[in-house]
């Protein structure tokens, strides 16, 4: 592959990363695969500054991020360490709530209407954000 030096059409550049913001919803796994087909990943939030940037672009809408605990511990999709990394959960979250009646708990993280994070049922059709880093060795995602 060749190094990506600028963001594809319809993606937003910020701090050496490219971001794409959906305006429709998918289940977490389908959103994750969408990003992967773009040679990207669901957004990984590593700082308060990045949190504010993403929050500004998504507005007060539930939106998936690249954080889940489907296999036990919470994990970022790109391997960023969860325990030592940035977190912005709502109070009392994550709670792995079973009371929704949909079966199982809550294993996927999303931005809530105020930007803070909540865990929810992964099948819910929320908007999502893809992220890919500039200067990494890979081809550009498909132009939109």
């Amino acid at each position: 592959g060749s190094e990506r030096t600028c963001c594809p059409v319809n993606w937003v550049e910020h701090e050496r990363s490219c971001y794409w913001f959906s305006r429709s919803g998918k289940a977490w796994a389908d959103a994750d695969n969408y990003c992967r087909l773009e040679d990207a990943h669901l957004v990984v939030v590593t700082s308060w500054e990045e949190q504010k940037f993403v929050q500004h672009h998504i507005g007060p809408v539930n939106t998936w991020m690249g954080l889940h605990d489907q296999n036990g511990p919470w994990k970022w999709v790109d391997g960023t360490d969860y325990e030592t990394g940035f977190k912005n959960w709502r109070p009392e979250q994550p709670d792995d709530w079973y009371g929704h009646g949909l079966g199982g708990g809550e294993d996927c993280a999303h931005f809530t209407d105020d930007g803070r994070w909540n865990d929810d049922v992964c099948q819910r059709p929320y908007r999502w954000v893809c992220e890919t880093e500039l200067d990494k060795a890979s081809q550009e995602p498909p132009l939109l």
Epitope: S24, G25, L37, S138, E140
Partner: antibody
Framework: EVQLLESGGGLVQPGGSLRLSCAAS????????MNWVRQAPGKGLEWVSA????????FYADSVKGRFTISRDNSKNTLYLQMNGLRAEDTAVYYC??????????????WGQGTLVTVSS | DIQMTQSQSSLSASVGDRVTITCRAS??????LNWYQQKPGKAPKLLIY???SLQSGVPSRFSGSGSGTDFTLTISSLQPEDFATYYC??????????FGPGTKVDIK
């Protein structure tokens, strides 16, 4: 002219292998995720496999997982499907197709003419 | 997995007719629905994506509608070149984009 051209199909015995190729021209191949879709004789369409533009992410239908491998060579503008452990039910016309993504909607915009794979003893 | 059904496996129509083809998803897929046309011995051709967006180069007599689980492809005035098989496809479950079984439009 935007074009996809498949090759590599033919008659193969059950358990055998075949490698399909799809040569792209007329567009920036590396910018597009690609798919293989098949159609058994007289039947409907079935998605088989997908690969991202850079080739780093691959996906398979359960029916072919562990037997088929999708890959691409962007320097040659070519998509491949390595098919091992072929079964009679894999008999079909195999199409390569490019994925477009517009505002989150995905579809297969460009299709090749197809190549016939027949698995029979 | 999401199953797609097309209630009519075939329908007969005449040139100039208004033709409606329906498609149903086994669960809500919002507007993640595409329509393709396929003629015998040829590859499918994309007509409509995102339930209602017309693919570039496709005649305006083709239109799509619907959301959730029920979708419709309409040909406002059937032309001789429109006799073909039409497939719907969901694009909600990336990338497992399942197709409907098809509806063949033939000459009455």
């Amino acid at each position: 002219e935007v074009q996809l051209l498949e090759s590599g199909g033919g008659l193969v015995q059950p358990g055998g292998s075949l490698r399909l190729s799809c040569a792209a021209s007329g567009f920036t191949f590396s910018n597009y995720a690609m798919n293989w879709v098949r159609q058994a004789p007289g039947k409907g369409l079935e998605w088989v496999s997908a690969i991202s533009g850079g080739g780093g992410n691959t996906f398979y239908a359960d029916s072919v997982k562990g037997r088929f491998t999708i890959s691409r060579d962007n320097s040659k503008n070519t998509l491949y499907l390595q098919m091992n452990g072929l079964r009679a039910e894999d008999t079909a016309v195999y199409y390569c197709a490019s994925r477009i993504a517009v505002a989150g909607s995905e579809a297969f915009a460009i299709w090749g003419q197809g190549t016939l794979v027949t698995v029979s003893s | 997995d999401i199953q797609m059904t097309q209630s009519q496996s075939s329908l007969s129509a005449s040139v100039g007719d208004r033709v409606t083809i329906t498609c149903r998803a086994s669960q809500s897929i919002a507007s993640y629905l595409n329509w393709y046309q396929q003629k015998p011995g040829k590859a499918p051709k994309l007509l409509i994506y995102g339930a209602s967006s017309l693919q570039s180069g496709v005649p305006s007599r083709f239109s799509g509608s619907g959301s959730g689980t029920d979708f419709t492809l309409t040909i406002s005035s059937l032309q001789p070149e429109d006799f073909a098989t039409y497939y719907c496809q969901q694009s909600y479950s990336t990338p497992l984009f399942s197709f409907g079984p098809g509806t063949k439009v033939d000459i009455k």
